[in-house]
Interface confidence: low
């Protein structure tokens, strides 16, 4: 027979040789990191075919390493389900734990035993110090110092000083998250007052007001011979300015010289602050103009944000 | 480390005023939040007031209308006004370091004694 | 403003007795409480906060428990050193506050 064969859990007692006669036997040992339990053959023969009698290491098992329990407020789940040295063992937190520690324990062989690569890790519960103060304004559970996960407090703006209010730009309300981070930047409390929209051969149909503060939306129409450069819904944003820019209403060309353009509300790179001008006359669109009176709005003489002042 | 002394302690009448200083050293004063607290026989340990690092401050409200704490950065001080004392503000006064953001008191200086007395 | 009531307000236990110390809050305070030594002629020194957690430096024979609005410090073998007065102090709501003291002495 040639070399004996070779396993990965159990190794030849002795040097092999290059060649060995009918009927001489070789025995093995298991290798280090594993032991022997009965009643598995760990030898074999070279027969008169010669080929080795059948032998396997099943009778070799791996080193394990010792049971390590669950953290408090976690999971211990070792890779492949066996404690074995060569395999890892994996740490997981709860919701509202963090790790402090290793998140991955590796059973490694120490001379003949099988131990951890290091100790255990804990799971921390998740706390939060005060959310940031901000300027002219406070939050919910100010007087709270420490915040646990998922905490949540609201911000509002504190009454402003002079004729206009404070307005929350941001999220109102953040959490205590992972990390021990606080779920998003905190919003900021500031007066924001866009000025009067003004569209000169257009009108004003919602929106009415005397003053026009954060997220003010207004819409407008254009007069009769002229279409809509940009958008018919302009916002108050956190900078005073409208959002998208106050659009203008430009005169329709005769359908004999060119064609009107597509209502495409693009945004124009100059504005105009001019009071409106009465609509000139001139030949009708060749699209359908918006509608003038829309339903439900109310007619400009009713101004509807008069009685927020 | 930062070290935090306190001074201005003595004896005054009761009407008077008087301004605690809280001294940091190995440490900006404005880099932490600073607690006044006040211990006498009789009435124990009492919290009067906080200033956090962005410059506001908390006050215990029964002491709100009489004591002001503010900050001096360019003397990397913490100060105490006290008003209208009486006599039963007489206590060993501390200024204490907030523990990193949290309201557990680990740091305190020895004191600075106030008595009101006529 | 929460009033923490602290009991008993005095005791004498001998060197190496368990020594049991509670606080009550007028208030649910969950578990922000944490308890003070001041040793005769000192400033008082933080041990345990957040109700359980001990300050470096302070010996594992303190200990700290309790949730709500009842808590309590043990120390499982009083020492000599450990004399002074005891204090508890909440801080989930301004103004923070500290119990009355209790007075620890040995026999």
């Known amino acids: 027979c040639e070399e004996p064969p070779t396993f990965e859990a159990m190794e030849l007692i002795g040097k092999p040789k290059p060649y060995y006669e009918i009927g001489e036997r070789v025995d093995y040992k298991c290798k280090k990191g594993y032991f022997y339990i009965p009643p598995l053959a760990t030898h074999t023969i070279c027969d008169r075919n010669h080929t080795w009698l059948p032998v396997s290491d099943d009778a070799c098992y791996r080193e394990t390493c010792p049971y390590i329990r669950d953290p408090l407020n976690g999971q211990a789940v070792p890779a492949n389900g066996t404690y074995e040295f060569g395999y890892q063992m994996h740490f997981i937190c709860n919701e509202g734990y963090y790790l402090i520690g290793e998140e991955i324990l590796y059973c490694e062989l120490k001379g003949s035993v099988a131990i951890w690569s290091g100790k255990p890790p804990i799971c921390e519960k998740v706390l939060c110090t005060p959310p940031p103060k901000i300027k002219n304004g406070k939050h919910t559970f100010s007087e709270v110092e420490v915040f646990e996960y998922l905490d949540a407090v609201t911000y509002s703006c504190d009454p402003a000083p002079g004729p206009d209010p404070f307005s929350l730009i941001g999220e109102s309300t953040i959490y205590c998250g992972d990390n021990s981070v606080w779920s998003r930047a905190a919003p900021e409390c500031k007066v924001v007052k866009c000025r009067f929209p003004v569209v000169e051969n257009g009108k004003q149909i919602s929106g009415f007001g005397k003053k026009f503060y954060y997220k003010a939306t207004v819409m407008f129409e254009c007069d009769k011979g002229f279409y809509l450069d940009g958008s018919d819904t302009i916002v108050c944003d956190s900078n005073s300015t409208w959002d998208p820019p106050v659009p203008k209403c430009l005169k329709v060309l005769p359908p004999s010289s060119t064609k009107p353009p597509a209502l495409s509300h693009s945004v124009s790179t100059s504005s105009t602050t001019k009071s409106p001008a009465s609509s000139a006359s001139g030949p009708r669109p060749t699209y359908k103009p918006p509608v003038s009176n829309y339903p439900g709005y109310p007619k400009p003489e009713e101004g509807i944000l008069d009685s927020l002042d | 480390e930062v070290q935090l002394v306190e001074s201005g302690g003595g004896l005054v009448q009761p009407g008077g005023s008087l301004r605690l200083s809280c001294a940091a050293s190995?440490?900006?004063?404005?880099?932490?939040?600073i607690s006044w607290i006040r211990q006498s026989p009789s009435r124990g340990l009492e919290w009067l007031g906080v200033?956090?690092?962005?410059?506001?401050?908390n006050y215990n409200s029964a002491f709100m209308s009489r004591f002001t704490i503010s900050r001096d950065d360019s003397k990397n001080t913490a100060y105490l006004q006290m008003n209208s004392l009486k006599t039963e503000d007489t206590a060993v006064y501390y200024c204490?370091?907030?523990?990193?953001?949290?309201?557990?008191?680990?740091?305190w200086g020895q004191g600075t004694l106030v008595t009101v007395s006529s | 403003a929460i009033q923490l009531t602290q009991s008993p307000s005095s005791l004498s236990a001998s060197v190496g007795d368990r020594v049991t110390i509670t606080c009550r809050a007028s208030q649910w305070i969950s578990n922000y409480l944490n308890w003070y030594l001041q040793k005769p002629g000192q400033s008082p020194q933080l041990l345990i906060y957040y109700t359980s957690s001990l300050h470096s430096g302070v010996p594992d024979r303190f200990s700290g428990s309790g949730s709500g609005t009842d808590f309590t410090l043990k120390i499982s073998r009083v020492e000599a050193e450990d004399v002074g007065v005891y204090y508890c102090q909440q801080y989930i709501k301004l103004p923070w506050t500290f119990g009355q003291g209790t007075k620890v002495e040995i026999k």
């Open positions: 200033i956090w690092t962005d410059g506001g401050t």
């Open positions: 190995g440490g900006s004063v404005s880099s932490y939040d």
């Open positions: 204490e370091r907030v523990y990193d953001g949290y309201p557990w008191f680990a740091y």
